[in-house]
């Protein structure tokens, strides 16, 4: 589908002239045809923001440790976490580790694993909490 | 039948500027982008930019910014490319191609071959 | 160094098929199905033989057919023909919203 295009400006730092006033809306990426934007395909790729793409940006596939918390749709890409009882601290690009068991002797558990993080034990006579 | 018919050979000095033409028949020369590309001797193609027939905007890779203008005169269907501060490392066959409906190039123009030497 | 890897040279005899592989990464071959070839002759242009990985242009023959996998793309020419010699080149759009090419491959066809 074409669609029009969008005249609000968007900062962009691969282009030395930045084509104001020519960007496509969200959703969709410019077409081959000057003044035209094509749709993005749901489920296939997506642009975030007004743009000047020759091709929307293709959504993301969870790795095989992730779950998929919400799917790629036109606007906004794939977010994936990790699978339950296993979590990746928040900004790390590493795989999706085990979540502890249990609470070393004398402490207690007082926040459960989430894909985020891993459980929360503080000692029993101190309420500081500390992860392990 | 769409054809592009570019300028002829250059022979330009180091740190001199060369501009190239892109003449544009047999379709509406506003109907497409247009892109720059080059090939060095015996080497590989390189993108050099797109530009964009309505408006005159144009976008570039880093490597070439500062150094390269495309311009147009849609009154003679016509698209140039001028490169400035030319290094012997610009001697290249400079083409300009038409974007495709797929992100392709489709059709060419024959090359113009501009040599940088001193 | 070209963004996109292709084997410097290929051959075979008239009749046969050859391949040639184009890798790249997640953001350009990996990423798009926008991956082309094109066919240049010594002295000329080059011609778009196939574009979005395996579709071919109208008066382009049916000898042509390209794939990919992953990071690799591929173009298969079958009944190779003398004047199918020629250099092949790999094309890819990126996440960059640039366009990239292989170093080319030259194709000799033998005999």
């Known amino acids: 589908a074409t669609i029009k295009l969008h005249d609000q400006s968007i900062g962009t730092q691969q282009w030395e002239h930045s084509p104001l006033g020519e960007l496509c809306p969200p959703g969709s990426h410019r077409s081959e045809r000057p003044g035209a934007c094509n749709r993005c395909t749901e489920g296939v790729g997506y642009t975030n923001a007004s743009n000047n793409l020759f091709a929307c940006l293709p959504c993301t596939a969870c790795k095989s440790d992730e779950e998929e918390r919400s799917p790629c749709t036109t606007t906004r890409n794939t977010a994936c976490q990790c699978k339950p009882g296993t979590f990746r601290n928040d900004n790390s690009a590493e795989m999706c580790r085990k979540c502890s068991t249990g609470c070393p002797r004398g402490m207690v558990k007082v926040k459960d694993c989430t894909p985020w993080s891993d459980i929360e034990c503080v000692h029993k006579e101190s309420g500081n909490g500390h992860n392990i | 039948e769409v054809q592009l018919v570019q300028s002829g050979a250059e022979v330009k000095k180091p740190g001199a500027s060369v501009k190239v033409s892109c003449k544009i028949s047999g379709d509406s020369f506003t109907a497409y982008f247009i892109h720059w590309l080059r090939q060095a001797p015996g080497e590989g193609l390189e993108w050099m930019g797109w530009f964009n027939p309505i408006s005159g905007t144009a976008g570039s890779p880093q490597k070439f910014h500062g150094r390269v203008a495309m311009t147009r005169d849609t009154s003679i269907s016509t698209a140039y490319m001028e490169l400035t501060r030319l290094a012997s490392d610009d001697t290249a066959i400079y083409y300009c191609?038409?974007?495709?409906?797929?992100?392709?190039?489709?059709?060419w123009g024959q090359g113009t071959l501009v040599t940088v030497s001193s | 160094q070209s963004a996109l890897t292709q084997p410097a040279s290929v051959s075979g005899s008239p009749g046969q098929s050859i391949t040639i592989s184009c890798t790249g990464t997640?953001?350009?071959?990996?990423?798009?199905?926008?991956v082309s070839w094109y066919q240049q002759h010594p002295g000329k242009a080059p011609k778009l033989m196939i574009y979005?990985?395996?579709n071919r242009p109208s008066g382009v023959s049916n000898r042509f057919s390209g794939s990919k996998s992953g990071n690799t793309a591929s173009l298969t020419i079958s009944g190779l023909q003398a004047d199918d010699e020629a250099d092949y080149y790999c094309?890819?759009?990126?996440?960059?919203?640039?366009?990239?090419f292989g170093g080319g491959t030259k194709l000799t066809v033998l005999g």
């Open positions: 191609a038409r974007q495709h409906h797929s992100n392709t190039f489709d059709p």
């Open positions: 094309s890819s759009y990126t996440t960059s919203n640039t366009w990239v």
């Open positions: 997640n953001s350009d071959v990996g990423g798009y199905n926008y």
């Open positions: 979005e990985v395996n």
